[in-house]
Interface confidence: low
């Protein structure tokens, strides 16, 4: 069927459309254009002859039209008149006659929008304000944009006019945004310039910063005022009711106690007209004196006194606070607070209590410290200790000895051999011992201020010949390859020399084994199974030498990956099956047993007796050392076949 | 204490192969365990792929057999999967695990899982 | 091979209620353990060989049976207990249970 279809459908003003005939029959004579839904000679644009290939002019040629071979009409430099129907009127060789219709619509290139306002700055929640879109075009589309968003569903925005005015009602300050209006027609869409609305606000209760309302007598008063407004606010200041200066802040230096009262800001607009106002009250308090701390005992004596002490001066209404150590007051039950806290009582003190203590007086503003107090508390002597730790003497050396005992005050010293007192010093020098200085040397601790006294005792030896030594360690299961040992080699003796041996070798050079404190002490680290050795310390000096007894290291290693016995894996149907695993341990290790993944029985040997070719599969052992807290396993696959389908089986066991 | 870490790539395309590694720390291979691998489709219930232990020994779930290979480098204290022919069946969560010793065999340590997609 | 069914496959309880999962087997089993897995995250070890309690895991998670039926209990729902929940059998080779998902209501 022969159709009409024009491109494009709807044609701007100034350019061009198609219209594309379809479905053209053969043989034809010619054919003519007409404006219009009919054929109508006075309407004809254009007729075309095919077989004179003539096209003549009608009396609706505007000289825009081009007519084509195939009766496609060009019409350029489009009016908005073209608008409407186009009729072509086929005639064909047999003069039968064929009408067709299309149509297109012509719209005007839309111009560049504005927006014009009613009223330029309006009032937060009181005025109105009626935007629109100028010019006004027939057919034309009205769109708006807010922040180039489309418009937010809310009752106080309203379309009308055809979209062309957008109306706010009760305008806000959160409406100050860029306004933009659109047009569109089906041949052109145009956006207009923005429009930023100005809403005037405010001013809201002003805010007065900072928040504190109290300060001390001779600090600086800085108060500063905002309240949040279109145009800016502005400030006034009011003390006492009492107008003080237009500014948005106010100070006030080095201000008493007359400056405590009632400061007021207003913050004014202008242009709404409004004012609003904020009031703090502001208390200056005078400075309170420092205090400072009394004790009714400045000697205690441990772990017998009380001490009390006590914050002054007494002031009614008063929070009273403690420290120790730069510390808030530890909880402990020797600790007592009174009832209105200023006195702290040390019940049973120790030396650890010497302090330094500090009170302090709380008031409105802060804390004031006063200056910090140390204890003197009288403990000791403790026992005392002597030294060198040597027991052991050569004949023909000095003896040195030298003894101490904590005490507060320091503790006075007595020596004594044997029970008989020999001197009131420190220390103690007896030069070219012999035998006879063989004996108890008792060192004896005094303090004067609590009369305590305490004592030890300690043998020494004078001989030639050296004693038996032992050997002491840090380790009696080290696990391998993860622990260190030290061995000691007991008594230090002075001017002797220490030996070792192990499984009566002298030492292997070994980068695990460490000499050190003199020889004394061997340390192997990293011990493994093959450290499990018998160790022998000796003791020499220039005439007599001496050694210990053995003393052999037990190493804890393993388990090591098992082995599983016999080797067979092939086995005859029928033959009795006896596995048997073993795995280097030390302790021994715990077996198990794992059948294609089952798990079995904990047991070393596994025994299955007239195994079938059901018994196929992976025999699996675990062993676990609950010492060392480590694991090993291994898989051996097992293949039972029919008795005597293949030759060269094990029998099993 | 004890960690695995999975790592491989996300993607895999049809017919290649998928290759995993998990990396443990805090506890050495070599001393012993089995290391596991169970798998996650997105939806779905856990399915176990297979163990490996220090040694090399293996085990591998009946269904998944004939495309599974396990690897141990005690080395580097790793182990690691490789699943081929991969389909789109093969997209999941892939976890690896330590199979603790105390005779009853469960999973007492596991990595935080590695998604693998597979897709062309 | 052994078939696992885990029931339910979903459930939805108040907090403090006593939730209850089974798990049975087509064959008998030595041990059953028991999993919870939060979204996003790796299953977790709750309960090994039936009935013990793995290191660090609250009381109130506890499991039992034996031959081919076990029982994992909360005696008391908590809102981190939101989560799915697997059984885990090792015969042949291991299995888990379908899942049970145990939400609040």
């Known amino acids: 069927k022969l159709t009409i279809e024009s491109t494009p459908f709807n044609v701007a003003e100034g350019k061009e459309v198609l219209l594309l005939v379809h479905n053209l029959p053969q043989h034809l004579f010619g054919y003519s254009w007409y404006k219009g839904e009919r054929v109508d000679g006075n309407r004809q644009i254009i007729g075309y002859v095919i077989g004179t290939q003539q096209a003549t002019p009608g009396p609706a040629y505007s000289g825009r039209e081009i007519i084509y071979p195939n009766a496609s009409l060009l019409i350029q430099n489009i009016i908005q008149n073209d608008t409407g129907f186009y009729t072509l009127h086929v005639i064909k060789s047999d003069l039968v006659n064929e009408e067709a219709t299309g149509q297109f619509r012509v719209y005007p290139e839309l111009p560049k929008p504005s927006i014009s306002s009613n009223n330029s700055k309006p009032v937060e929640d009181k005025d109105a304000v009626a935007f629109t879109c100028e010019p006004e075009t027939q057919d034309a589309t009205y769109l708006w944009w807010v922040n180039n968003q489309s418009l937010p569903v809310s009752p106080r925005l309203q379309l009308s006019n055809g979209n062309r005015t957008l109306t706010l009602f009760n305008v806000t300050r959160n409406d100050t945004a860029s306004y933009k209006c659109e047009t569109q027609n089906p041949v052109s869409a145009r956006r207009s310039d923005s429009v930023i609305l100005n809403v005037l606000y405010g001013p809201d209760a002003p805010t007065i910063s900072p928040l504190n309302t109290s300060y001390r007598s001779g600090e600086n008063l800085n108060l500063s005022c905002h309240a949040a407004s279109n145009p800016p606010a502005q400030y006034s200041w009011f003390v006492n009711g009492t107008f003080q200066q237009s500014t948005q802040e106010l100070f006030i230096p080095n201000i008493t106690v007359n400056n405590s009262g009632s400061y007021t800001c207003q913050a004014h607009n202008s242009d709404t007209g409004l004012n609003r106002t904020t009031v703090t009250t502001i208390t200056v308090y005078a400075e309170p004196p420092k205090p400072f701390i009394t004790s009714n005992n400045s000697n205690p004596v441990e772990d017998e006194d009380a001490v009390a002490l006590t914050c002054e001066p007494e002031i009614q209404n008063t929070t009273y606070l403690w420290w120790v150590n730069n510390q808030s007051l530890p909880v402990s039950p020797r600790l007592q607070l009174s009832n209105d806290n200023r006195t702290l009582t040390l019940l049973s003190v120790t030396r650890n209590d010497v302090g330094p203590y500090e009170c302090g007086i709380q008031n409105e503003l802060s804390v004031d410290h006063s200056d910090p107090v140390i204890l003197n508390v009288l403990y000791g002597p403790d026992d005392p200790t002597i030294s060198p730790s040597y027991t052991y003497y050569r004949p023909g050396v000095n003896l040195s000895l030298s003894c101490h005992a904590a005490s507060n005050p320091p503790a006075q010293y007595s020596w004594l051999i044997d029970g008989n007192i020999q001197q009131h010093t420190q220390e103690l020098f007896i030069s070219n011992i012999t035998e006879k200085n063989s004996g108890l040397y008792t060192c004896q601790a005094n303090n004067s201020a609590s009369g305590h006294s305490r004592t030890t005792v300690k043998t020494i030896t004078v001989s030639a010949e050296l004693p038996k030594p032992s050997i002491s360690s840090n380790n009696s299961k080290p696990v391998e390859d993860k622990d260190a040992v030290a061995f000691t080699c007991e008594p230090e003796a002075q001017n002797t020399t220490y030996l070792w041996w192990v499984n009566g070798q002298s030492l292997p050079v070994s980068p695990r084994l460490q000499l050190s404190n003199g020889n004394r002490t061997l340390t192997l680290f990293n011990v493994t199974r093959n450290d499990a050795r018998a160790y022998v310390c000796g003791i020499q000096n220039s005439v007599s030498a001496n050694r210990s007894d053995p003393v052999t290291l037990d190493v804890l290693y393993g388990p090591d990956t098992p082995i599983i016995s016999p080797p067979d894996s092939s086995y005859l149907s029928g033959a009795n099956l006896n596995l048997s695993c073993h795995s280097a341990s030390n302790p021994s290790p715990q077996y198990s047993w794992r059948i294609n993944g089952i798990p079995q029985q904990h047991t070393q040997v596994l025994f299955i007796a007239k195994i079938t070719p059901n018994n196929n599969g992976t025999y699996a052992c675990f062993v676990s050392n609950l010492a060392t807290g480590r694991n090993n396993s291994i898989v051996k696959s097992i293949t039972v076949s029919a008795s005597g389908t293949s030759p060269g089986l094990s029998a099993g066991a | 204490q004890v960690q695995l870490q999975e790592s491989g790539p996300g993607l895999v395309r049809p017919s290649q192969t998928l290759s995993l590694t998990c990396t443990v720390s805090g506890f050495t291979i070599s001393s012993g365990y089995s290391w596991h691998w169970v798998r996650q489709p997105p939806g779905r219930g856990l399915e176990w792929i297979g163990y490996?232990?220090?040694?090399?020994?293996?085990n591998y779930n009946p269904s998944l057999k004939s495309r599974v290979t396990m690897l141990v480098d005690t080395s580097k204290n790793q182990f690691s999967l490789r699943l081929s022919s991969v389909t789109a069946a093969d997209t999941a969560v892939y976890y690896c695990a330590r199979e603790d010793y105390d005779y009853h065999w469960y999973f007492d340590v596991w990595g935080q899982g590695s998604l693998v997609t597979v897709s062309s | 091979d052994i078939q696992m069914t885990q029931s339910p496959s979903s459930l939805s309880a108040s907090v403090g209620d006593r939730v209850t999962i089974t798990c049975s087997t087509s064959s008998s089993v030595s041990y059953m353990h028991w999993y919870q897995q939060k979204p996003g995250k790796a299953p977790k070890l709750l309960i090994y060989s039936t009935s013990n309690l793995a290191s660090g895991v609250p009381s109130r998670f506890s499991g039992s049976g034996s031959g081919t039926d076990f029982t994992f209990t909360i005696s008391s729902l908590q809102p981190e207990d939101i989560a799915t929940y697997y059984c885990h059998q090792w015969s042949s080779y291991p299995t888990f249970g379908q899942g049970t998902k145990v939400e609040i209501k």
């Open positions: 490996i232990q220090y040694s090399g020994i293996t």
